[in-house]
């Protein structure tokens, strides 16, 4: 199956790589603008240059192109925890992300929040804090692991999943009970 | 399979209070922080709050901060979202969120619709 072009892809396919189709005169092909710049004017004809001009501050364009306009900087969430790695130039967008250990949880695709790795008190780090992942935590003797952190088995209850897993613990305490009334 | 289900939604006077609630189902909830995100009409996502695993640590979008509470039970896998002193602003569908990847999908949404 052949992808379904856009006009603006099929009127660009028509010129040579790094060039784009005049869209008042198809027979001319202009030169895109560089990164960094934007498209001021078109080419006024065929091997004559188009009119690019530098993004302004808090705006870029991080390909060749032929925009209008340069795009905005995106604002790292505060809210979210974000922190800015590196600023926005005329072309490379901001590059945020999060502090040491801590690691990014995306909502949506372009959407994420820093939150703190585990830190495995009472265990052992099964699998290090990534930057999209969580420590994954086990627990010492005599824990089990709720919520990713390490509780004292002394907090399991009956009826909860930790009874499997602090089950050699509790049979400890019940033999020493049993020894001692003999 | 992940499977998130919202409840709660409904019409409600400027002012009024809703709460709204998600019970999941398909994943290890206690370990997972978790979020709730709202579409209003016409308009793109809008994150509102999110609350970590174990509930201690909450988030808020300042347009609900002081009127929305978020909090969650973890023994019933159910998250929660209080809403008070509701505003016409607050129409939207709401949902509940876990992780964003190409498998996990968000629920159908309740709707909350603010309006005398």
């Known amino acids: 199956l052949v992808p379904h072009l856009g006009d603006r892809e099929k009127r660009d396919s028509v010129c040579p790589q790094g060039k784009y189709i005049h869209p008042q005169n198809n027979s001319i092909c202009c030169t895109k603008c560089h990164k960094g710049t934007y498209l001021y004017n078109d080419c006024p004809g065929p091997g004559q240059d188009t009119d690019c001009r530098e993004c302004e501050s808090g705006s870029f364009t991080a390909s060749e192109n032929h925009l209008r306009h340069c795009l905005s900087c995106s604002k790292c969430r505060k809210e979210m925890g974000q922190v800015e790695i590196s600023s926005c130039t005329v072309d490379r967008d901001t590059v945020c992300g999060c502090r040491k250990n801590q690691y990014r949880h995306y909502w949506s695709e372009n959407l994420f929040q820093c939150f703190n790795c585990s830190l495995c008190l009472n265990g052992t780090v099964h699998l290090s804090c990534q930057e999209k992942q969580n420590t994954v935590c086990t627990c010492h003797a005599g824990f089990f692991l709720r919520e990713n952190e390490c509780v004292s088995c002394s907090n399991c209850k009956k009826s909860l999943e930790c009874t499997k897993l602090c089950l050699p613990q509790i049979e400890n305490v019940k033999g020493t009970e049993d020894s001692g009334t003999t | 399979e992940v499977q998130l289900l919202e409840s709660g939604g409904g019409l409600v006077q400027p002012g009024g209070s809703l709460r709204l609630s998600c019970a999941a189902s398909?994943?290890?909830?206690?370990?997972?922080?978790m979020a709730w995100v709202r579409q209003a009409p016409g308009k793109g996502l809008e994150w509102v709050s999110t609350i970590s695993h174990t509930g201690r640590d909450t988030y808020y979008a300042d347009s609900v901060k002081g009127r929305f509470t978020i909090s969650r039970d973890n023994s019933k896998n159910t998250l929660y979202l209080q809403m008070n002193s509701l505003r016409a602003e607050d129409t939207a569908v709401y949902y509940c969120?876990?992780?964003?990847?190409?498998?996990?999908?968000w629920g159908q949404g309740t709707l909350v619709t603010v309006s005398s």
């Open positions: 969120a876990k992780r964003w990847s190409s498998f996990d999908y």
């Open positions: 398909g994943f290890t909830f206690g370990y997972e922080p």
